[in-house]
Interface confidence: low
Amino acid sequence: VEDEKPKVNQKLYMCVCEGLSCGNEDHCEGQQCFSSLSINDGFHVYQKGCFQVYEQGKMTCKTPPSPGQAVECCQGDWCNRNITAQLPTKGKSFPGTQNFHLEVGLIILSVVFAVCLLACILGVALRKFKRRNQERLNPRDVEYGTIEGLITTNVGDSTLAELLDHSCTSGSGSGLPFLVQRTVARQITLLECVGKGRYGEVWRGSWQGENVAVKIFSSRDEKSWFRETELYNTVMLRHENILGFIASDMTSRHSSTQLWLITHYHEMGSLYDYLQLTTLDTVSCLRIVLSIASGLAHLHIEIFGTQGKSAIAHRDLKSKNILVKKNGQCCIADLGLAVMHSQSTNQLDVGNNPRVGTKRYMAPEVLDETIQVDCFDSYKRVDIWAFGLVLWEVARRMVSNGIVEDYKPPFYDVVPNDPSFEDMRKVVCVDQQRPNIPNRWFSDPTLTSLAKLMKECWYQNPSARLTALRIKKTLTKIDNSLDKLKTDC
């Protein structure tokens, strides 16, 4: 789901931003400003900030203060500068509920002037309200406790879809607001381990009855966790073909630090796993490759404006880092090696992750170390090479005339299972080999077009390779011609 854009007629205000969730910036721009006070582990946490999305503010600002938190909202430049939210003192009725019941009372009075009825409603509602707040303040988890922070009232009653739909981070990121991220993370129950590797583990978890994926990084891959966290929290990355980020957290568990990245859960697993078990028809094959191309094009492009994003190159694109969704599309995962580029400042942010990409998918210029490391386009071209290999993996599993190839990884016939840098360099740079295109592909128009496309991703000269946008357009064209063919029949 794309993040909701501010309504055109909504005025934006400058707000004071205080608290560690402000991304080290002391102001922010939004449709409403807020000042909040919440109890965190028994201590008062004051925060100020803004809501970029009007609905988010509406939802939060209407929440009456409780013993656990209070939020005061306002509209106007710097209007929250001198506002300090106050927790209600015991015994006092809450202003929020007073106003609410006053409105209700007037409506009832106008209909059936029953003042006593209003008193009854007030009594019952306040009793219910008190009880609900007591329940909410009970620790949810003995080991961690629940961090009661801004908007967590709504977290308890919202689905992830709703939260992400109306999310506004204090930066321009694509996840939940910072305070909510930690709350969500601490409310997750790990159910089953669905993947293990050098990176750590992936678990299926449950949050409020919804499935989420929890990637638990090994301590040696801490920089990948930091990089993904940094990226998702500073770049607007919400796109149907990029794995949906929910939250990131660092916890001390069993006396060791655990690094969690929480994302949407896709039960079909990775494209790598999916291709082992499934053969594809033309439609599903094109849906897969077009969705990957769309995700990659979104990563590669820089979008300007308030809802913009830096250009990003993935640097570890492979079938294991692509997930299959229920609708047959895919989404790109694992941004732990990603590089960012901003045209306006001409800044290239390579990060400092010692991890390197997967050798099997490395482009010739990476293998022979001729890559221009200070040029962002170089990294995009590396992604295109890898995309071509993924395209080949997928195309092999597309049935034509009743024939299909077994799933095999790229270069399966010329390098060992865990190829070394030198193995790959010899095959790709010295011998300039490319994955074999089976003859049967040329008797199918779609596979013929895909073969041509992948070859244009595999040029030895990086600058000759296609761009992600061109690939996306070509695949869309192939897809459309298939539709036309179907309607003509």
């Epitope: 608290g19 969730s21 201590f43 008062h44 930690r182 940094e230 939250a247 400042t345 400092n352």
Partner: antibody
Amino acid sequence: EVQLVESGGGLVQPGRSLKLSCLASGSTFSNYGMKWIRQAPGKGLEWVASISRSSTYIYYADTVKGRFTISRDNARNTLYLQMTSLRSEDTALYYCAAAISTPFYWYFDFWGPGTVVTVSS
Amino acid sequence: EIVLTQSPTTMAASPGEKVTLNCLASSSVSYMTWYQQKSGASPKLWIYGTSNLASGVPNRFSGSGSGTSYSLAISSMEAEDVATYYCLHLTSYPPYTFGAGTKLELK
């Protein structure tokens, strides 16, 4: 993550000026709030100044207010500290530090190795 | 402005000994951050959010506290733990005040 290297330190006479620089690499500099922290010989750490990501908000310790100016050039990945009217008590090892706010109530801090400023006649 | 007072100023511990360093705030704070600084090196983030160990910090370290009283503990002192430890309270706005530090030595 960001790596930081300070430069510009040296021996200077009281009342004179000096400009320190801190070059950042390895990450997008503009994502980080920056600060200068100093440590007098054999003493503890003292926060000197802070600057927000886009230079909108700048803060100084009372001991340097009016004499020191913190600034940054995001295009050059560089943080500066212009020091004027230097005093002997400004003698210290000056560290630049970067802070990124992650999704919890605390900072990740990255520090440079420091540059020595000696104010003496 | 919150003042942080660390105690003791200096302490020596034998290998294997349990060590506790204290940090007292002049008024109640929400959480505490600790830094380790070895001789001739830059300070390193050691404990954040009162009790969370920074990456690479051995599990023998722990942090605790609330209100005005915070502490850093080492369950079993090792030679590599010799350093000066500073506490810091990060507020929304500066000034940021560090404690004066506790120098931990090996007996």
